[in-house]
Each structure stands twice: as structure tokens, then as C-alpha cells.
């Protein structure tokens, strides 16, 4: 039974506007038509789900309307963007990929991307 490898960058620095993007790539052992991608955040051994999307190969990823994630897919590659991040959201963001259909089912978990978020300094008052 083949394994499914999931690759993601080790470190990403969020922009000053609290946006972080990274690629989650999976080596598909089969010809999946339905794929589920989940992003989890691990901090201090606590794991929480950040967002999840199921998509049909060749179609766009659709996250829930209130999700902080957006993404696009191209082949076995998913480009993920997480927005609204603050310094307290710094942590390890894990990409989990599931090949839902057709059988057999496959699951792969990436090593995680450490996202660093630095809150911008407030603008000093200017005296004119």
C-alpha cells in the first residue's frame, strides 16, 4: 500500500498586513478526482483546525465564506493563503491532504510550515 508524501516549506514570514502564503504539494499515488486539504495549527502541543476545503481535480478550492484561508490548485499542488494573522498566531501550520475519491483512500501529512507573524509597529504621531 503506497504512502503519500506531502511537501511544504519549513518557514514562512507573514507580511506586515498579516498575510502568509505557502505551497502544499502532494505526490499522488493514484488518480484522485476528489481531494480534501486541511490546514492545522500546532502551538504548545495544542492542535486546532484553521481551515479545510474539498475540491474536484481541475476545479477551484472552495473554503467557507468566513474562512481566513483562500487557495488555488494546480495539479498536485495547492497554493494556500492565510490572512488576518497576528503575532499570537505564530505557530506550525500543518498541511493535511486526503484523496477522497476514487478508492483507495490516501492520507498524507506535511512536516508543517512555521509561520512567523510580527505585528506592525503603530505609526508614530507626526508633528507638522
Amino acid at each position: 500500500c503506497k504512502a503519500m508524501h506531502v511537501a511544504q516549506p519549513a518557514v514562512v514570514l507573514a507580511s506586515s498586513r498579516g498575510i502568509a502564503s505557502f505551497v502544499c504539494e502532494y505526490a499522488s499515488p493514484g488518480k484522485a478526482t476528489e481531494v480534501r486539504v486541511t490546514v492545522l495549527r500546532q502551538a504548545d502541543s495544542q492542535v486546532t483546525e484553521v481551515c479545510a476545503a474539498t475540491y474536484m481535480m481541475g476545479n477551484e478550492l472552495t473554503f467557507l465564506d468566513d474562512s481566513i484561508c483562500t487557495g488555488t490548485s494546480s495539479g498536485n499542488q495547492v497554493n494556500l493563503t492565510i490572512q488576518g494573522l497576528r503575532a499570537m498566531d505564530t505557530g506550525l501550520y500543518i498541511c493535511k491532504v486526503e484523496l477522497m475519491y476514487p478508492p483507495p483512500y490516501y492520507l498524507g501529512i506535511g512536516n508543517g510550515t512555521q509561520i512567523y507573524v510580527i505585528d506592525p509597529e503603530p505609526c508614530p504621531d507626526s508633528d507638522f
Epitope: L40, Q42, V47, I94, L107, G108, I109, G112
Partner: nanobody, 115 residues
């Protein structure tokens, strides 16, 4: 090195119950998924159920209603309670562990449902 040790298989009559256990040894990531696959003679290896360290559970259709997966994170052990067993549940059952960037298989445990 991570190792998985399974137990609890055996011969049971139709309608009976079995509880499979799988214990992981070695260092594993705090986020992980443990689960069970099964392979009947001449068939492919299929997922039965899995459970993540944060409690998220997934069941295959064939397992819903009769099988219950649970885990003890402190013991790094996953359990599969199988009730109302049928002859078609006869298979080799494999434990699987997914950790960050890797996965591992257990050896195997035979489950035979027969009168």
C-alpha cells in the same frame, strides 16, 4: 525508530465482538493520526477508520455503526472495537500511524469471523 505493535485479533463467531489494540513506541509528533486498514484475500487494503490526536475521526462506510475507534494519547495507543461481526469482516487488519512528514505500518493481526 517508530514501531507499532498490534493485538486483539482472533477467531470469533458471527455476531460476536473483538477489540483490536495498536501501541506505538518511539518518538512521534504531537499531531498524528492513528488508524486501521484491512485486507481481505484477493482484495486491496482499505481504510476502516482513523482518529487524529486532536480527536477528529473518520470511518469508512463499511465500519459505520458497528465499529468504534478510540485512542489514548498518553499511551500512544489506538483501539478498534468491532461489534456485530460478519463473515465479510474476515481479513488481515493493519494498524497505521501518520506523523508529520511520514507514516508507519504495523505488522498485521488476523480477524476471522466464522461459525
Amino acid at each position: 525508530e517508530v514501531q507499532l505493535v498490534e493485538s486483539g485479533g482472533g477467531l470469533v463467531e458471527p455476531g460476536g465482538s473483538l477489540r483490536l489494540s495498536c501501541a506505538a513506541s518511539g518518538s512521534i509528533s504531537s499531531y498524528n493520526v492513528m488508524g486501521w486498514y484491512r485486507q481481505a484475500p484477493g482484495q486491496q487494503r482499505d481504510l476502516v477508520a482513523h482518529i487524529a490526536s486532536n480527536g477528529e475521526i473518520m470511518y469508512a462506510d463499511s465500519a459505520k455503526g458497528r465499529f468504534t475507534i478510540s485512542r489514548d494519547n498518553a499511551k500512544k495507543t489506538v483501539y478498534l472495537q468491532m461489534n456485530s461481526l460478519k463473515p465479510e469482516d474476515t481479513a488481515v487488519y493493519y494498524c497505521k500511524l501518520w506523523v508529520l512528514g511520514n507514516d508507519y505500518w504495523g505488522q498485521r493481526t488476523q480477524v476471522t469471523v466464522s461459525s
